[in-house]
């Protein structure tokens, strides 16, 4: 999938951490569709 | 050690495409993401987006996202990333860095220098 | 986006000085925000995460503060290898985003 950031957006990330994705695990899975 | 090794310097005509190739080593690859960043010739550090390796999900500055196409090869554990459309204010040096979560882009390549010239 | 102002943009200081780089951002990025070295011709180099944090391998001699939207970069006695150019640049959310850079020259 891909995101697209640069535009003005809410965010509702906690304080204590950062809102970037992160690391990835090979744990991740793709969402389906 | 961690190494992160980009292709040599190009040179096209505006309207072009370039691909610009990061090999990374001394780490595993699949770990962290890869970001690219370019920097125009007496200017700043614009960060152009990044790509995961595993998912290869992407997330873009919206000001490139029409024209980048960022991609990966994990068998080699290299990042590419090739910008379309090229015009001569892309003449830049281009970096990959691998971005942690914790510390941001914690290692760079060496750049790679493109120039866009008639 | 957030925008980061660094100031200021060029400064001239000698070997054995203390200098302080800020970084002010547009809003609060809590507590993330990296340095970066740069000198001609070279790729950026990570000195300082998390606002604070020292990178593995940079001398003590450099130190970030700060939190929210006002941080600081202080070299406590200069060194001849440490006149280059200064980049803030945060990482709390997406877009990520340098500052303009500090431009350090040996007066």
């Known amino acids: 999938s891909e995101t697209t950031t640069g535009t003005s957006s809410n965010s509702s990330q906690s304080t204590s951490n950062s809102g970037l994705a992160p690391n990835p695990t090979n744990a991740t899975t793709k969402a389906a569709g | 050690q961690v190494q992160l090794v980009q292709s040599g310097a190009e040179v096209k005509k505006p309207g072009a495409s370039v691909k610009v190739s990061c090999k990374a080593s001394g780490y595993d690859f699949t770990g962290y993401h890869m970001g690219w960043v370019r920097q125009a010739p007496g200017q700043g550090l614009e960060w152009m987006g990044e790509i995961n390796p595993i998912t290869s999900d992407k997330t873009f500055n919206q000001k490139f996202k029409s024209r980048v196409t960022m991609t990966r090869d994990t068998s080699i554990s290299t990042a590419y990333m090739e910008l379309s459309r090229l015009r001569s204010d892309d003449t830049a040096v281009y970096y990959c860095?691998?971005?942690?979560?914790?510390?941001?882009?914690?290692?760079w390549g060496q750049g790679t220098t493109v120039t866009v010239s008639s | 986006d957030i925008q980061l102002t660094q100031s200021p943009s060029f400064l001239s200081a000698s070997v054995g000085d203390r200098v302080t780089i800020t970084c002010r951002a547009s809003?609060?990025?809590?507590?993330?925000l990296a340095w970066y070295q740069q000198k001609p011709g070279k790729a950026p180099k990570l000195l300082i995460y998390?606002?604070?944090t020292l990178h593995s391998g940079i001398p003590s001699r450099f130190r970030g503060s700060g939190s929210g939207t006002e941080f600081t970069l202080t070299i406590s006695s200069l060194q001849p290898e440490d006149f280059a150019t200064y980049y803030c640049?945060?990482?709390?959310?997406?877009?990520?985003?340098f500052g303009q850079g500090t431009k350090l020259e040996i007066k």
């Open positions: 809003k609060s990025i809590s507590k993330y």
């Open positions: 998390a606002g604070s």
């Open positions: 860095a691998r971005r942690d979560y914790g510390t941001s882009l914690d290692y």
């Open positions: 640049q945060q990482h709390n959310e997406y877009p990520i985003i």
